[in-house]
């Protein structure tokens, strides 16, 4: 069947379109083109007959078409009125006619559009806007687009006129956005600019910053004041109602007290003609005096005095606080705070409450502090220690003896020989000491300020000969596997040599032996029982040695798993069943029984007579050690027959 | 007469306390250890904490450890066991056991009954 197709359907003004023949009959005479849906001689457009390959023009000829061999025709330079049906009309040889029509559709090419407004300055909550596509275009859609993105869904957004107008009902300050409008129709499609939607909105009632609402007397007033606004709001100062300044910011120097008040922020928009305000309530305090301490006592005793300390000034409905070693007050029977803590008592003083010491008074904005107290505590003399330990000399050397003793004033000194005040010093110095300077050699501290005195006595001993050694130890009974010991060969002697002698043999090399102080002391690690041997100690010079007496150290260990005994597990009724039980240990353990879970008795051995049938089961021993805290135990099974039912079986003990 | 006297077990409820008391007449307890052994049907016996008067030494089984102090006073010749925290599996018969320092003598108490249920 013939057909015609329109190449495009929708055809831009200025362009060209092609009516393509599809399916022309064989054998034909000519065609002709004309306007409108049917043959209509006066709306001709050309003609064509094939045998002479002759176009003949007809009255609807625009000189802007032309017809092809194959029937088609080409219209060039598109206009609006092109827009309609166009019939071929098909003569063939037999002189039969044939008709087909198409059509196609012209539209022009949109200009780019623009967007009006009814509104350039809506105001926030009130006003609406209404924004239109221009130009009116026939036959054209409308889109629109808001900050690049297609329409949201709000009930405060309205299309109308064919979508031509958006209508934006009661703007907030979200509706500040980009807006864009888009013209299509089948043949272009045209953006507009941006166009930028001012709302003017606010002010929102005013933040004051800093929030801060307490200030000290001297320091500097600033204030900032901010409100969301479009345009930018104008801002006033008023002190208690007082207009000050049209600024944002307020300024005072060096505040009193009498800059106390309520402080107001007004902003005014002039656009909206709104005005919001906020108040903020300011409160400047007196600068409190800064404290300080007074004692009842500056030079307090050790365990003898008590101390007062007083916050000053006394001010009323004021909290004071304390402070020791830059640390809160700790918990203490001897520190008492009176009722309204201004008065700090250190009951029976000790040489470590010397501080220092601070109080505070505390106001609504800071605590201020006073200067750090010392307490100056008069303690000792302590025991005097005389150094060095040294107790045996050789004839000829130097003795250079000094004491020392903790005291607050500083202790005097004072040295004794056999009772004899020697000379008022804190060292004492003889040099090439004899035999006869052996004695007892006492220092005497004094303390002047508590009127306290004390003494500590050394025998030194001169002679060639050195004395018996002996050994102390620092545990005298270990557990093994967990204890260390230290043997410590006495006494300490200058220019002497120390040994040591395990079972009357030199020490043994073992990295849990080590040996210290100038081979004085022996330490053993992680001692075991077979540690438990005679240790000795000799000392000696280039004159003489000696060794101590052996001391045998006790290492407590176990209890072992205990050993039931005899081995037996199978007895004939009517034995005597004679059970004993043994453990490796030191001290020797505590003993007890079970049979069948059944405590018995707290005893080594278990007895029982004539045994039968009913003796059979579980029997466990236990065994534990006070000493090292540990515990053990053995289960034995033991089975009883009737007599003479099993050959080989034990008759007892 | 060598004599061990324990007292002040009892019924008491998860959580709560008790203080064992081992008088001890006939020796003095200066030169000894003195244990607490405890015995639950089904459990082995367990040595749960003892006190060597000559080293001041103390021991204790894991598990009681931090609930449960050993303590003696040598003038009244007693030691005592101070029971903190009671769980059921404190249930038991309590023994006071006695050893001297050389471990030339062993000495038990006949045992309190401590019952801990809600």
């Known amino acids: 069947k013939l057909t015609i197709e329109s190449t495009p359907f929708n055809v831009a003004e200025g362009k060209e379109v092609l009516l393509l023949v599809h399916n022309l009959p064989q054998h034909l005479f000519g065609y002709s083109w004309y306007k409108g849906e049917r043959v209509d001689g006066n709306r001709q457009i050309i003609g064509y007959v094939i045998g002479t390959q002759q176009a003949t023009p007809g009255p609807a000829y625009s000189g802007r078409e032309i017809i092809y061999p194959n029937a088609s025709l080409l219209i060039q330079n598109i206009i609006q009125n092109d827009t309609g049906f166009y019939t071929l009309h098909v003569i063939k040889s037999d002189l039969v006619n044939e008709e087909a029509t198409g059509q196609f559709r012209v539209y022009p090419e949109l200009p780019k559009p623009s967007i009006s407004s009814n509104n350039s300055k809506p105001v926030e909550d009130k006003d609406a806007v209404a924004f239109t596509c221009e130009p009116e275009t026939q036959d054209a859609t409308y889109l629109w687009w808001v900050n690049n993105q297609s329409l949201p869904v709000s009930p405060r957004l309205q299309l109308s006129n064919g979508n031509r107008t958006l209508t934006l009902f009661n703007v907030t300050r979200n509706d500040t956005a980009s807006y864009k409008c888009e013209t299509q129709n089948p043949v272009s499609a045209r953006r507009s600019d941006s166009v930028i939607l001012n709302v003017l909105y606010g002010p929102d009632a005013p933040t004051i910053s800093p929030l801060n609402t307490s200030y000290r007397s001297g320091e500097n007033l600033n204030l900032s004041c901010h409100a969301a606004s479009n345009p930018p709001a104008q801002y006033s100062w008023f002190v208690n109602g007082t207009f000050q300044q049209s600024t944002q910011e307020l300024f005072i120097p060096n505040i009193t007290v009498n800059n106390s008040g309520s402080y107001t922020c007004q902003a005014h928009n002039s656009d909206t003609g709104l005005n919001r305000t906020t108040v903020t309530t300011i409160t400047v305090y007196a600068e409190p005096p800064k404290p300080f301490i007074t004692s009842n006592n500056s030079n307090p005793v050790e365990d003898e005095d008590a101390v007062a300390l007083t916050c000053e000034p006394e001010i009323q409905n004021t909290t004071y606080l304390w402070w020791v070693n830059n640390q809160s007050l700790p918990v203490s029977p001897r520190l008492q705070l009176s009722n309204d803590n201004r008065t700090l008592t250190l009951l029976s003083v000790t040489r470590n409450d010397v501080g220092p010491y601070e109080c505070g008074i505390q106001n609504e904005l800071s605590v201020d502090h006073s200067d750090p107290v010392i307490l100056n505590v008069l303690y000792g003399p302590d025991d005097p220690t005389i150094s060095p330990s040294y107790t045996y000399y050789r004839p000829g050397v130097n003795l250079s003896l000094s004491c020392h003793a903790a005291s607050n004033p500083p202790a005097q000194y004072s040295w004794l020989i056999d009772g004899n005040i020697q000379q008022h010093t804190q060292e004492l110095f003889i040099s090439n000491i004899t035999e006869k300077n052996s004695g007892l050699y006492t220092c005497q501290a004094n303390n002047s300020a508590s009127g306290h005195s004390r003494t500590t006595v050394k025998t030194i001993t001169v002679s060639a000969e050195l004395p018996k050694p002996s050994i102390s130890s620092n545990n005298s009974k270990p557990v093994e596997d967990k204890d260390a010991v230290a043997f410590t060969c006495e006494p300490e002697a200058q220019n002497t040599t120390y040994l040591w002698w395990v079972n009357g043999q030199s020490l043994p090399v073992s990295p849990r032996l080590q040996l210290s102080n100038g081979n004085r002391t022996l330490t053993l690690f992680n001692v075991t029982r077979n540690d438990a041997r005679a240790y000795v100690c000799g000392i000696q010079n280039s004159v003489s040695a000696n060794r101590s007496d052996p001391v045998t150290l006790d290492v407590l260990y176990g209890p072992d798993t205990p050993i039931i005994s005899p081995p037996d597990s199978s007895y004939l009724s009517g034995a005597n069943l004679n059970l004993s039980c043994h453990s490796a240990s030191n001290p020797s353990p505590q003993y007890s029984w079970r049979i069948n879970g059944i405590p018995q008795q707290h005893t080594q051995v278990l007895f029982i007579a004539k045994i039968t049938p009913n003796n059979n089961g579980t029997y466990a021993c236990f065994v534990s050690n006070l000493a090292t805290g540990r515990n053990n135990s053995i289960v034995k099974s033991i089975t009883v027959s009737a007599s003479g039912t099993s050959p080989g079986l034990s008759a007892g003990a | 007469e060598v004599q061990l006297v324990e007292s002040g077990g009892g019924l008491v409820q998860p959580g709560g306390s008790l203080r064992l008391s081992c008088a001890a007449s006939g020796f003095n307890i200066k030169d000894t250890c003195i244990g607490w052994v405890r015995r639950a049907p089904g459990k082995e016996e367990e040595l749960v904490a003892s006190i060597c008067q000559y080293s001041g030494y103390t021991r204790y089984a894991d598990s009681v450890k931090g609930r449960f102090t050993i303590s003696a006073d040598t003038s009244k010749n007693t030691a005592y066991l101070q029971m903190n925290s009671l769980r059921a599996e404190d249930t038991a018969v309590y023994y006071c056991?006695?050893?001297?320092?050389?471990?030339?003598?062993?000495?038990w108490g006949q045992g309190t009954t401590v019952t801990v249920s809600s």
């Open positions: 056991a006695i050893t001297s320092h050389h471990g030339d003598y062993n000495y």
